[in-house]
Amino acid sequence: MMTGTIETTGNISAKKGGSVILQCHLSSTMAQVTQVNWEQHDHSLLAIRNAELGWHIYPAFKDRVAPGPGLGLTLQSLTMNDTGEYFCTYHTYPDGTYRGRIFLEVLESSVAEHSARFQIP
């Protein structure tokens, strides 16, 4: 039985040209995390972090995605096209797969505040 829950940074905003941390956290389970996949709203892959084999970063993002912190991703040099949904998929043993959602809004405003809070979707 899957007892865990995914906590995410929820709905976040950041300014164009800046950077943002996409972070998910799996809690309430003793399952072993074998891999975390990060995908964008159109289901294209940003990155994979395998527990033993490390990081794979999709070529389109190699210049502006930094692995981490932890199992998260830092997305840099934000553009308006980065606005949208991001999904973290946790592959675990023995539980199976958990999925979390983050919505990122990239703002033109130079005074846009980076607002983030952990929430259970």
């Epitope: 294209s44 892959l45 994979i48 084999l53 490390g54 970063i57 999709y58 070529p59 389109a60 190699k62």
Partner: antibody
Framework: QVQLQQPGAELVKPGASVKLSCKAS????????IYWVKQRPGQGLEWIGG????????NFNENFKSKATLTVDKSSSTAYMQLSSLTSDDSAVYFC????????????WGQGTLVTVSA | DIVMTQSHKFMSTSVGDRVSITCKAS??????VAWYQQKPGQSPKLLIY???YRYTGVPDRFTGSGSGTDFTFTISSVQAEDLAVYYC?????????FGGGTKLEIK
């Protein structure tokens, strides 16, 4: 340039073990994973597993977990795969491969070692 | 395990023709797919990855596309030297798996 050097062939008896080598050159050995792929004669490709040379961590295809052991020797920039309790099903070409920069795709391949299991 | 199915084991084509090889994943693999070429007696070579990026030095007649579960590898104008077996491979989740291969034969 990046090179992965493997011995051409190994002849081993059923029940025995064999340790295949893959000597890497032309890049920083600990910066890229080494993967192993099996190809039986006239057949397709099968991923065995991979090793992270910086820390020795391994990830296996479950089908090979009790068959293969993956290790590295950082001092000689060499990856090893030991195959145990060999049977005729293990007769195949074994390739070592290296990933791309921050990529899991197999960008560089050794020439492969043909393992023949025969009494 | 994710099964990668290449529906054609053999494809016959002529020099100058356009040919497409398809690969279907048994479950979602996003864009974590690569294509390899293996000529007789040689090691495989990476041609396309992720799944539309041409690897360094690969001629531009080779292209790839797709996402999710359906992927296509295309040679826009087949050359005699393209005689080979072509494999798709997913690295979305371990164990990473290959398709069974498609052997391209030149008429």
């Amino acid at each position: 340039q990046v090179q992965l050097q493997q011995p051409g062939a190994e002849l081993v008896k059923p029940g025995a073990s064999v340790k295949l080598s893959c000597k890497a050159s032309g890049y920083t050995f600990i910066s890229y994973n080494i993967y192993w792929v099996k190809q039986r004669p006239g057949q397709g490709l099968e991923w065995i597993g991979g090793v992270n040379p910086s820390n020795g961590n391994t990830n296996f295809n479950e089908n090979f977990k009790s068959k293969a052991t993956l290790t590295v020797d950082k001092s000689s920039s060499t990856a090893y795969m030991q195959l145990s309790s060999l049977t005729s099903d293990d007769s195949a070409v074994y390739f070592c491969t290296r990933g791309n920069y921050y990529g899991y795709e197999f960008a560089y391949w050794g020439q492969g070692t043909l393992v023949t299991v025969s009494a | 395990d994710i099964v990668m199915t290449q529906s054609h084991k053999f494809m016959s084509t002529s020099v100058g023709d356009r040919v497409s090889i398809t690969c279907k994943a048994s479950q979602h693999v996003s864009t974590a797919v690569a294509w390899y070429q293996q000529k007789p007696g040689q090691s495989p070579k990476l041609l396309i990855y992720s799944p539309s990026y041409r690897y360094t030095g690969v001629p531009d007649r080779f292209t790839g596309s797709g996402s999710g579960t359906d992927f296509t590898f295309t040679i826009s104008s087949v050359q005699a030297e393209d005689l080979a077996v072509y494999y798709c491979q997913q690295h979305y989740s371990t164990p990473w798996t290959f398709g069974g291969g498609t052997k391209l034969e030149i008429k």
